[in-house]
């Protein structure tokens, strides 16, 4: 009789352990679902806010035609400026035409006045050729005036209405550029 009772007790204990395991699994599953839900909601929120706020450029960016521009409020060296633009899903400004150059310099005059702003132009150390960040060459009218006698890497910047060159390790403001969102209307 005693043996029978102890067997039943062991079985009950085993059952309890299994139930505890099941409860633990369920709690874990519930927590995982809650996390998934949180990410899903965040995604929906992002998508909805993008849909509602269908402005072609983010806040504090300036639009001109198909481009959005961000004029920095901090100084950094050229390489860090590029990183800062990438964080925003953009690259340093690439000036394609005189019209774009005029828009940029006109906007800078209104915003800040005559400061130095890094753009996505750098001089290849071996060939001495100026290239934009994507590897393309600037049009002949958009080559920096030679001002830098630096032995270090040389990068391009905008000041007033000119393109100039300087040691990439000097600190300047910078301008980022990204494509404007196309309106779906």
């Amino acid at each position: 009789k005693l043996l029978q009772v102890s067997t039943i007790a062991m079985q009950q204990q085993e059952k309890l352990i299994q139930q505890e395991r099941a409860l633990l699994n369920f709690t874990e599953w519930k927590r995982s679902c809650a996390l998934q839900m949180k990410y899903c909601q965040a995604f929906m929120q992002n998508s909805l806010s993008s849909a509602h706020n269908s402005s072609p450029c983010p806040n504090n960016w300036i639009q001109n035609r198909e481009s959005c521009y961000y004029v920095s409020e901090i100084w950094s060296i050229w390489h860090t400026s590029q990183e800062n633009c990438l964080k925003e899903g953009s690259t340093l400004l690439q000036i394609e035409s005189k019209e774009e150059m005029d828009f940029i310099t006109g906007s800078l005059r209104k915003i800040k006045g005559s400061y130095d702003y890094w753009v996505g132009l750098s001089q290849d150390g071996h060939s001495g050729r100026w290239l934009w960040q994507d590897g393309s060459s600037p049009s002949p009218g958009l080559l920096p005036a030679e001002r830098s006698q630096s032995a270090n890497q040389v990068c391009g910047y905008v000041k007033s209405n000119s393109l100039l060159s300087s040691n990439c390790s000097t600190w300047k403001y910078f301008i980022c550029e990204k494509y404007a969102l196309r309106s779906s209307v």
Epitope: Y39, C40, N46, L86, K87, E88, G89, S90, E177
Partner: nanobody
Framework: QVQLQESGGGLVQPGGSPRLSCAAS????????MGWYRQAPGKQRELVAA???????AYADSVKGRFTISRDSAKNTVYLQMNSLKSEDTAVYYC??????????WGKGTQVTVSS
């Protein structure tokens, strides 16, 4: 947590053309840009190439015209096609993701050794 898995590195002959891949997986996140960086022994880590979610590209001067970065947005994967490799391209190549929430994620790196 976000995982970045690089592949495609190894021993390559000078002039060779390997392609590196970096696949991002884990919790859902929006990507602002993805990039490849490299670090040669005794040198600082430097940006090699990057691509934004809009498709804009940026390259280091030393690789312009030889390397091409591309992406597959659907797979959250970025590729680096490396052509005309030189011994100075020997380094550990790291993948980096700039997420829209401001977070940045690094891969563990893949070794590329250019030697005959």
């Amino acid at each position: 947590q976000v995982q970045l898995q690089e592949s495609g590195g190894g021993l390559v002959q000078p002039g060779g053309s390997p392609r590196l891949s970096c696949a991002a997986s884990g919790r859902f996140f929006r990507v602002n840009a993805m990039g490849w960086y490299r670090q040669a022994p005794g040198k600082q880590r430097e940006l090699v190439a990057a691509i934004t979610n809009g498709g804009q590209t940026a390259y280091a001067d030393s690789v312009k015209g030889r390397f091409t970065i591309s992406r597959d947005s659907a797979k959250n994967t970025v590729y680096l096609q490396m052509n005309s490799l030189k011994s100075e391209d020997t380094a550990v190549y790291y993948c980096k993701v700039f997420a829209a929430d401001g977070m940045e994620y690094w891969g563990k790196g893949t070794q590329v050794t250019v030697s005959s």
